[in-house]
């Protein structure tokens, strides 16, 4: 005759408030004859959770049909879980006896604890933009989870980061916890299209972690490079000078032309193009009138990018005699 074993497979059961908890219990033998009852806690003050034969347990239902002849499954479901339901639950086999049934064997118990899912992680970047090669900090916060154990990872474009510091509060017992992590990220020039991801894994998420993201485009400033060139061909009595502003981000840019130190107000033609890496190029054309009186023209292209100090590039205009002749020839 096989000795009766009471099997409660889960040591810990995490449940959410308002949901239904399933407590598993199976027996390995039908003998001795007698009922299986569920209790919370141990000792004389233990609380009766379910007795199939008598009492009133409106929140409890059985998983299988306890009335079936050879039933060995005494699992129960408890509905509408509240914080008052936490504790350790035992299924206990009794042997029929007189005057009272006698406790025969208890299962090892299943601890029911309240699990609360973490909130969606919120990732915040730096307040001000920073240029490539510098380090910026991102913070990730998630709240309201329980139990305290939680895993947080950082990624940049799918690559896991290692330079971060994480705190879970409070350190003592609590109904819910919060996590805050700060990651240090070195900016690369091509990071306009990059993303940092904060990933939170918790037992209540059943292997489906929550993610919060931040775009590095919010944190990076790629300063432009400037090049001013004179086009070899002239148009009538005008020479075309080009200012190429390359590889900058964000798009916010002011460009002004100066002729021998005097800011030119007249309209200039320009084009804006976006590069594959998310940076921009800006090209501005400036037409300079060529005349005999103007031997040394210095043109300056000045760029103010994203509220930073202006940068400029100068070009001393080369007007050859041949060009002047052509110019005068062209003038009617």
């Amino acid at each position: 005759e096989e000795e009766l074993q009471m099997i409660q497979p889960e040591k810990l059961l995490l449940v959410t408030v308002g949901k239904t908890a399933t407590l598993h219990c199976t027996v390995t033998s039908l003998l001795p004859v007698g009922p299986v009852l569920w209790f919370r806690g141990v000792g004389p003050g233990r609380e009766l959770i379910y007795n199939q034969k008598e009492g009133h347990f409106p929140r409890v239902t059985t998983v299988s049909d306890l009335t079936k002849r050879n039933n060995m499954d005494f699992s129960i479901r408890i509905s509408s879980i509240t914080p008052a339901d936490v504790g350790t639950y035992y299924c206990v086999k009794f042997r029929k006896g007189s005057p009272e049934n006698v406790e025969f064997k208890s299962g090892p118990g299943t601890e029911m604890a309240l699990g609360a899912k973490p909130s969606a992680p919120v990732v915040l970047g730096p307040a001000a933009r920073t240029t490539p090669e510098h380090t910026v900090s991102f913070t990730c916060e998630s709240h309201g989870f329980s139990p305290r154990d939680i895993t947080l990872k950082w990624f940049k474009n799918g690559n896991e980061l290692s330079d971060f510091q994480t705190n879970v509060d409070p350190t003592g017992q609590s109904v819910a916890y919060s996590i805050r992590s700060t990651a240090r990220v070195v900016l690369d020039p091509w990071d306009v299209r990059s993303q940092v991801i904060c990933e939170v894994a918790h037992v209540t998420l059943q292997g489906d972690p929550l993610r919060g993201t931040a775009n590095l485009s919010e944190a990076i400033r790629v300063p432009p490079t400037l090049e001013v060139t004179q086009q070899p061909m002239r148009v009538g009595n005008q020479v075309n000078v080009t200012c190429q502003v390359r590889k900058f981000y964000p798009q916010s840019l002011q460009l002004t032309w100066s002729e021998n130190g005097n800011v030119c107000q007249r309209e200039t033609a320009s084009t804006l193009t976006e590069n594959k890496d998310g940076t921009y190029n800006w090209t501005s054309w400036f037409l300079v009138n060529i005349s005999d009186q103007r031997d040394d023209v210095v043109l300056t292209c000045q760029v103010k990018h994203d509220g930073q100090l202006a940068v400029s590039k100068r070009l001393a205009l080369e007007v050859t005699v041949h060009q002047k002749d052509q110019s005068s020839d062209a003038t009617p």
Epitope: G45, L48, E54, G55, H56, L66
Partner: antibody
Framework: EVQLQQSGAELVKPGASVKLSCTAS????????MHWVKQRTEQGLEWIGR????????KYAPKFQGKATITADTSSNTAYLQLSSLTSEDTAVYYC??????WGQGTLVTVSA | QIVLTQSPAIMSASPGEKVTLTCSAS???????LYWYQQKPGSSPKLWIY???NLASGVPARFSGSGSGTSYSLTISSMEAEDAASYFC?????????FGGGTKLEIK
């Protein structure tokens, strides 16, 4: 819906016996303990005993040992209370209940010569 | 056997008044096994409070139950006319199961 239908009122002579019935609907009696409770006019409730209809096991309050016999017939889904050697002290309303939660409407037993 | 003593045996209360009925056990009763029943004249008892403090279905929220060990109580926060009835405490912690003598609650 759980219902317990008890047999009608009984007028019996002292020394006689009476058998009361309690027929259940909405559940199988073999799945629950069936209890019997006595209530004398304008008085409290007294637990007589109970039966486990699944195997016929019974428990009685010492006061009712020898006075009351509880039986059950699972085929008709009915529990019974037999009272013997009746005296005027046995004049009361007798209730059956399912597992302490659902009660029948009661049966009045009057013992009178 | 466990003897349950209810007090008072009879009491009357005015509408809106707070009412407390007590049930004292001769030896300790686990709170899971202490029930209260309400009974009105000509009707069978109705399960009113189970496991010391849980209200049965349909019982108004003005009712509450508490206690442990040998001392239990049923409280009505604000008496209403429909609460006039007899209330019995009941233990099924050990055989023989026993009932208290009851408290007859009347409305003034």
């Amino acid at each position: 819906e759980v219902q317990l239908q008890q047999s009608g009122a009984e007028l019996v002579k002292p020394g006689a016996s009476v058998k009361l019935s309690c027929t259940a609907s909405g559940f199988n009696i073999k799945d629950y303990y069936m209890h019997w409770v006595k209530q004398r006019t304008e008085q409290g409730l007294e637990w007589i005993g109970r039966i486990d209809p699944e195997d016929g096991e019974t428990k009685y309050a010492p006061k009712f040992q020898g006075k009351a016999t509880i039986t059950a017939d699972t085929s008709s889904n009915t529990a019974y209370l037999q009272l013997s050697s009746l005296t005027s002290e046995d004049t009361a309303v007798y209730y059956c209940d399912r597992g302490l939660a659902y009660w029948g409407q009661g049966t009045l037993v009057t013992v009178s010569a | 056997q466990i003897v349950l003593t209810q007090s008072p045996a009879i009491m009357s209360a005015s509408p809106g008044e707070k009412v407390t009925l007590t049930c004292s056990a001769s030896s300790s009763v686990s709170s899971s096994y202490l029930y209260w029943y309400q009974q009105k004249p000509g009707s069978s008892p109705k399960l009113w409070i189970y496991s010391t403090s849980n209200l049965a279905s349909g019982v108004p929220a003005r009712f509450s139950g508490s206690g442990s060990g040998t001392s239990y109580s049923l409280t009505i926060s604000s008496m209403e006319a429909e609460d006039a009835a007899s209330y019995f405490c009941h233990q099924w912690s050990s055989y023989p199961y026993t009932f208290g003598g009851g408290t007859k609650l009347e409305i003034k």
